[in-house]
């Protein structure tokens, strides 16, 4: 259904354009598979315009359909590394609030050292996105190899 | 920070929507790892609306945050080809002006024959993007296997 | 070329924002390589805002440049599965009308169990997109592993 005619005549700022691109800060302690992210111009080419970070996890501030994308590269990795440590899996999901918990995007490193994907998904204000990396392998912190972002697409 | 109220009431044309999708033209001579791109309706489904090509490299015409995406497939490739010629790596970066030179996106072909990824990044008018393919393997020129594009997302 | 000044002053609804994200419904009968998709809030996080499904294939309702993205994961898959059944290839293309038939995006599963990519492409009202999976392997129907979507980007 098209959103109401009146709404569309508002200035574009009120329609959204929330966007964030994050770089890896650190991995979690043992038993915590989450990756912890950081963003901001002081750090390089990462940024948050709208969404916020909550203890290294991305929190959404505006309802809408978002394009979520991620790339994770394993550090000091060859195809034998990846296959020996199989299954190493990356999952992006809503981890909070608990009532909306769901896996949105999942990829395994088989004989590869990088996964990259993207998808469209509805997100709501307050949704926190977590990126879980199973296994014991360490992801690269190079900003051109590992990154995670969202882009507001429409209401 | 939200962009100024006055700016948002301008016609949409002034807000951007710059977009380009390119197909591979040729690889560089020896010692030049760059891929050379081409675009335009006469060539098929490639196009440039805003950005321009400068000797086969993509030059940005409008400041903003862009979604950059790429897929490169190696020609006549099997998983043994890719692993034998390891490391074959594709990097997308700002190569000019030199003061802004940086790698934005990097992926290796381990046992695979295709890499594909995307990311959000700030780009400025005059930035030229280069795509460097290390190694001796030849990329496919098929337009559904190898392509490179950018999409303006917001100021 | 910039689209006409008059058009840009129309309400945003008339400019598009068509978007769809689909989940796998079923595979075709033998000799039919197409994947059949479904979408709608009752099914989970899939949706169609503008485009429609025609017998499980996605039909475009608005001319424009679209970002097309896909991820397909093979069921019960390991790197040996993928390499033993090589070539298993996923192609996204315009399959109807026949006069506009073309492959837009093609990827092979070499030693991997997931392919994921995206590209910008012009699409016209009435174009139907088909996703063909060659070979005999079964794709996963998990909604975080296999999905297909389009996003209208500009006229």
């Amino acid at each position: 259904q098209r959103f109401a005619q009146a709404q569309q005549q508002l200035p574009l700022e009120s329609l959204g354009w929330d966007v964030a691109e994050l770089q890896l800060n650190h991995t979690g302690p043992q038993q915590d598979p989450r990756l912890y992210w950081q963003g901001g111009p002081a750090l390089g080419r990462s940024f948050l315009h709208g969404p916020e970070l909550d203890k290294g996890q991305l929190r959404i501030h505006r309802d809408g359909i978002y394009m979520v994308h991620i790339q994770v590269t394993l550090a000091i990795c060859s195809s034998t590394t990846a296959s020996r440590h199989h299954p190493t899996t990356l999952a992006v999901g809503i981890c909070s609030p608990a009532s909306r918990s769901i896996s949105l995007l999942r990829l395994s490193f088989h004989q590869g050292c990088t996964i990259a994907s993207q998808r469209l998904t509805p997100l709501a204000r307050g949704d926190t996105l977590c990126t879980n990396l199973t296994g014991t392998l360490l992801p690269s912190r190079n900003t051109d190899e590992t990154f995670f972002g969202v882009q507001w697409v429409r209401p | 920070q939200r962009f100024a109220q006055a700016q948002q009431q301008l016609p949409l044309e002034s807000l951007g929507w710059d977009v380009a999708e390119l197909q591979l033209n040729h690889t560089g001579p020896q010692q030049d790892p760059r891929l050379y791109w081409q675009g335009g309706p006469a060539l098929g489904r490639s196009f440039l609306h805003g950005p321009e090509l400068d000797k086969g490299q993509l030059r940005i015409h409008r400041d903003g945050i862009y979604m950059v995406h790429i897929q490169v497939t190696l020609a006549i490739c099997s998983s043994t080809t890719a692993s034998r010629h390891h490391p074959t790596t594709l990097a997308v970066g700002i190569c000019s002006p030199a003061s802004r030179s940086i790698s934005l996106l990097r992926l290796s072909f381990h046992q695979g024959c295709t890499i594909a990824s995307q990311r959000l990044t700030p780009l400025a008018r005059g930035d030229t993007l280069c795509t460097n393919l290390t190694g001796t393997l030849l990329p496919s020129r098929n337009t559904d296997e190898t392509f490179f594009g950018v999409q303006w997302v917001r100021p | 070329q910039r689209f006409a000044q008059a058009q840009q002053q129309l309400p945003l609804e008339s400019l598009g924002w068509d978007v769809a994200e689909l989940q796998l419904n079923h595979t075709g009968p033998q000799q039919d390589p197409r994947l059949y998709w479904q979408g709608g809030p009752a099914l989970g996080r899939s949706f169609l805002h503008g485009p429609e499904l025609d017998k499980g294939q996605l039909r475009i309702h608005r001319d424009g440049i679209y970002m097309v993205h896909i991820q397909v994961t093979l069921a019960i898959c390991s790197s040996t599965t993928a390499s033993r059944h090589h070539p298993t290839t996923l192609a996204v293309g315009i399959c109807s009308p026949a006069s506009r038939s073309i492959s837009l995006l093609r990827l092979s599963f070499h030693q991997g169990c997931t392919i994921a990519s995206q590209r910008l492409t012009p699409l016209a009202r009435g174009d139907t997109l088909c996703t063909n999976l060659t070979g005999t392997l079964l794709p996963s129907r998990n909604t975080d592993e296999t999905f297909f979507g389009v996003q209208w980007v500009r006229p």
Epitope: G93, I102, S103, L104, R106 | - | Q23, L24, N25, H26, T27, G28, P29, Q30, D32, L43, G44, A75, I76, T136, L137, L138, P139, S140, R141, N142, T143, D144, E145
Partner: nanobody, 126 residues
Framework: QLQLVESGGGLVQAGGSLRLSCAVS????????MAWFRQAPGKEREIVAV????????AYADSVKGRFTIAKDNAKNTVSLQMNSLKPEDTGVYYC???????????????????WGQGTLVTVSS
């Protein structure tokens, strides 16, 4: 809801063969795939093979590739599992399951399969 009834289990010597069968009844219009799982004593249930309901697409666990073949008989509405070159480690209860409900994945490989048979015991002696 589907009703699934397995048959064909039994005792067989290593290197021998068995053919399991699963009779499917009920509304199959939303069924995506049929699978065989197995559970060895003291171990988790694992997927062995799967076949698409609407076509001939299949997938197998690495441990059974080249030895087991899953097939579907449309006329009889049955799904079979031909097991050759059996090994003692193939011992376990074999379950037929139907994937009719869409979901996101979980760590448990049985996720998404909501209709199950009672199981049939396969014992491979050395």
């Amino acid at each position: 809801q589907l009703q699934l009834v397995e048959s064909g289990g039994g005792l067989v010597q290593a290197g021998g063969s068995l053919r399991l069968s699963c009779a499917v009844s009920g509304r199959t219009s939303s069924t995506y795939a049929m699978a065989w799982f197995r559970q060895a004593p003291g171990k988790e249930r694992e997927i062995v093979a799967v076949i698409g309901w609407s076509g001939g697409r299949t997938a197998y666990a690495d441990s059974v590739k080249g030895r087991f073949t899953i097939a579907k008989d449309n006329a009889k509405n049955t799904v079979s599992l031909q097991m050759n070159s059996l090994k003692p480690e193939d011992t376990g209860v074999y379950y037929c399951a139907a994937d009719s409900e869409q979901s996101s994945s979980s760590e448990g490989q049985a996720y998404g399969y909501e209709d199950w048979g009672q199981g049939t015991l396969v014992t491979v002696s050395s």
